[in-house]
């Protein structure tokens, strides 16, 4: 007799999600013999890269690569040594780098070159660092959610694959610099750019997706600050008793605040701005972010962007979850209906700085932005995307599914490693004795 080495039981994959405000690393694992199952890939571990997003290293590209080292060292420990060489490693950058690429393409290239240099120093199977399009970010988030919730296929007791009766879940992602909405639709899109056709496990999916650049939470907050400086001597979304000193150059350097930028301004001028806890004026300020004046299609969401009516259930993750979770958990407010969400936003916007600090002890300056964040989420869902009370009832706010973070990263890896076959497995599953 001779020893027969069993194949390693698990495979691994690594994705670096280079967001606008920070980078996260996700390590995924799956049983090697069950690659084509749905919901079989799960999160093994994760790591938050310290400091800002890679786009913040525009003036120091090598720093972007260096920033990843701590998490990559963790990956060396988390993935068994014998699996290192066979573990695919991807870096995908989103809206922060899209913005940098718009304003300074050379810096964007330098940053990606620097992170590539760092990633190639590690023993993993590095497969590239690139900027995802908004469409990719939306679709891969949708794939992640539905894969984890096993909405694509199901394995029956007789060992045959079958299509579950439940439909897919729409996905809404609120990042730092952009927001995405993606859902399955029956009717063809009037705007071809917003339609994606997918074939997964032998099933055909027609998916609507759109990404709104500059409508991520951080950019929205910056745009509201720019608007407040332009139209008020105070910030209606900040709590009364909160005052900050703003360098004008910091407000107007983003491409997202270009519309509010004065013709001439002193970028080094420091302006003092105080909050006024005014929910009604805050709502007006937030409303100014959306334009409904023209629509070249039969129907639009906002800013003349085609969108079919929202249909089915949705999962809202990332900053959607963090905002609603703050209202629910920290503030103890109900948010089960659109009306309650609006009331909760008004409640937060009515709080003074002292009241907020007393209500949520420990937290510091981030508290000042929850009013604007809540008001924006409420307006985006109701007025922007057109959720009514019935449709809103089908929205769940969740950051994880099956112990795995919901976001584009898993869907991206599944796609690039061909872990979701286009066609269904032809035979029932069995044991291979060869």
């Amino acid at each position: 007799t001779r020893d027969i080495r069993e194949p390693p039981a698990l495979k691994y994959g690594i994705v670096l999600d280079a967001g606008s405000s920070h980078t996260s690393m996700f390590i995924y694992k799956w049983p090697a013999d069950k690659e084509n199952d749905t919901g079989i890939v799960g999160q093994h571990s994760s790591c938050d890269v310290p400091g800002g997003g890679i786009s913040s290293y525009a003036d120091n590209p090598s720093g972007a690569g260096q920033s990843l080292v701590g998490c990559l060292e963790q990956a060396l420990r988390d993935v068994p040594k014998e699996r290192h060489a066979g573990t695919p490693l991807y870096l995908g950058a989103t809206a922060g780098m899209r913005l940098l690429n718009l304003t300074n393409p050379e810096a964007s290239t330098s940053v990606l070159t620097a992170v590539t240099h760092t990633l190639t120093q590690y023993p993993f199977d590095f497969r590239g660092a690139r900027i995802l399009s908004g469409q990719e970010e939306g679709v891969f988030g949708w794939v992640t959610a539905n894969y984890l919730l096993e909405n694509f296929i199901k394995y029956g007791w007789v060992g045959r694959w079958f299509r579950p009766r439940k439909g897919t879940l729409g996905a809404m992602d609120l990042g730092g610099a952009s927001t995405q909405i993606t859902f399955e639709t029956t009717s063809p899109a009037e705007d071809r750019a917003s339609e994606v056709q997918l074939r997964l496990y032998g099933q055909h999916y027609r998916v609507y997706t759109h990404s709104f650049l500059c409508y991520g939470r951080d950019q929205v907050l910056q745009r509201l600050l720019a608007s407040a400086l332009q139209t008020h001597s105070f910030h209606p979304c900040w709590p009364r008793g909160f005052s900050t000193h703003v360098l004008l150059g910091d407000v107007y350097q983003s491409p997202c605040t270009v519309a509010q930028r004065p013709q001439t301004f002193n970028s080094s001028a420091r302006v003092s701005l105080s909050g006024s806890s005014d929910p009604h004026l805050c709502r007006d300020l937030v409303s100014g972010l959306f334009s409904f004046s023209s629509c070249p299609f039969s129907r639009c969401s906002f800013n003349g962007v085609f969108q079919p009516p929202v249909a089915g259930n949705f999962i809202a993750f990332s900053a959607f979850f963090y905002t609603v979770n703050f209202l629910r958990t920290s503030m103890g407010l109900p948010v089960a209906t659109l009306q309650q969400l609006e009331a909760a936003a008004v409640n937060v916007c009515n709080q003074t700085w002292a009241q907020l600090q007393a209500r949520v002890p420990g937290q510091q300056a981030h508290l000042a932005d929850y009013c604007a964040g809540a008001m924006f989420v409420q307006q985006l869902l109701s007025r922007g995307y057109g959720f009514d009370e019935r449709a809103f009832g089908g929205v769940i706010f969740q950051k994880k599914a099956a112990d795995t973070a919901v976001g584009w990263a898993l869907g991206y890896m599944l796609n690039l490693t061909n872990l979701i076959p286009a066609d269904p497995p032809g035979l029932r599953k069995g044991t291979d004795f060869s």
């Epitope: 922060g96 950019q219 900050t244 700085w353």
Partner: antibody, heavy 129, light 111 residues
Framework: QVQLQESGPGLVKPSQTLSLTCTVS?????????WNWIRQHPGKGLEWMGY???????NYNPSLKNRITISRDTSKNQFSLKLSSVTAADTAVYYC??????????????????????WGQGTTVTVSS | DTQMTQSPSSLSVSVGDRATITCKAS??????????MNWYQQKPGKAPKLLIY???NLESGVPSRFSGSGSGTDFTLTISSVQPEDFATYYC?????????FGGGTKLEIK
């Protein structure tokens, strides 16, 4: 030029109330700043005690919450500290300082950093019988 | 509260030398990519003076030989070439969480 100056008794008896005043010149205390008290025990680091805001709101260090009161007198452009039931452990150099939230940008997201940029020279208070 | 631990507690250097002071927080003082860390300088008998905010941003008027770095729980203040006027005590301070807390200080002394 913004200037802050602490004043008050240098010696306080145990169990009594420590009272200090900070006089601000060159800036109105009702204009967008937070007016802090910080102390430094002999040979030790700094301890933030609390503030009164430009809007007259208070924020205190929880470790002192039931003993501390910070108030203001806008007509004199002053703010004051009262610390009750003092013990020898309250012997320290007491500083008043003006702080604010500085908006800073990083990685396409703005945030607010609490800094204290104007300080008084400090006054020594000894708690002893 | 977030505890701030500075090391070393004292540091002897010669004029022209490089000086490095570290500050370790008991928990991360980062939030969404921002580091809420400030550094102050205090000379004997004087009030503290703000040097650096947001971990690495130099306060206006502070010489460029001062620099700050770090994120999460580990931060560093570096003086690239120490000048006679730099001999003082340096404090780190976090403002991510209420109450703001300071480190115990590092006394920079002449060798």
């Amino acid at each position: 030029q913004v200037q802050l100056q602490e004043s008050g008794p240098g010696l306080v008896k145990p169990s009594q109330t420590l009272s200090l005043t900070c006089t601000v010149s060159g800036y109105s205390i009702t204009s967008g700043y937070y007016w802090n008290w910080i102390r430094q025990h002999p040979g030790k680091g700094l301890e933030w005690m609390g503030y009164i805001s430009y809007d007259a709101d208070n924020n205190y260090n929880p470790s002192l919450k039931n003993r501390i009161t910070i108030s203001r007198d806008t007509s004199k452009n002053q703010f004051s500290l009262k610390l009750s039931s003092v013990t020898a452990a309250d012997t320290a150099v007491y500083y008043c300082a003006g702080g604010y939230y500085r908006y800073g940008l990083g990685s396409y997201s703005g945030s607010y950093y609490y800094v204290m940029d104007y300080w008084g020279q400090g006054t020594t208070v000894t708690v002893s019988s | 509260d977030t505890q701030m631990t500075q090391s070393p507690s004292s540091l002897s250097v010669s004029v022209g030398d490089r000086a490095t002071i570290t500050c370790k927080a008991s928990q991360s003082v980062d939030y969404e990519g921002h580091s809420y860390m400030n550094w102050y300088q205090q000379k004997p008998g004087k009030a503290p003076k703000l040097l650096i905010y947001a971990a690495s941003n130099l306060e206006s008027g502070v010489p460029s030989r001062f620099s700050g770095s770090g994120s999460g729980t580990d931060f560093t203040l570096t003086i690239s070439s120490v000048q006679p006027e730099d001999f003082a005590t340096y404090y780190c301070q976090q403002s991510n969480e209420d109450p703001p807390t300071f480190g115990g200080g590092t006394k920079l002394e002449i060798k």
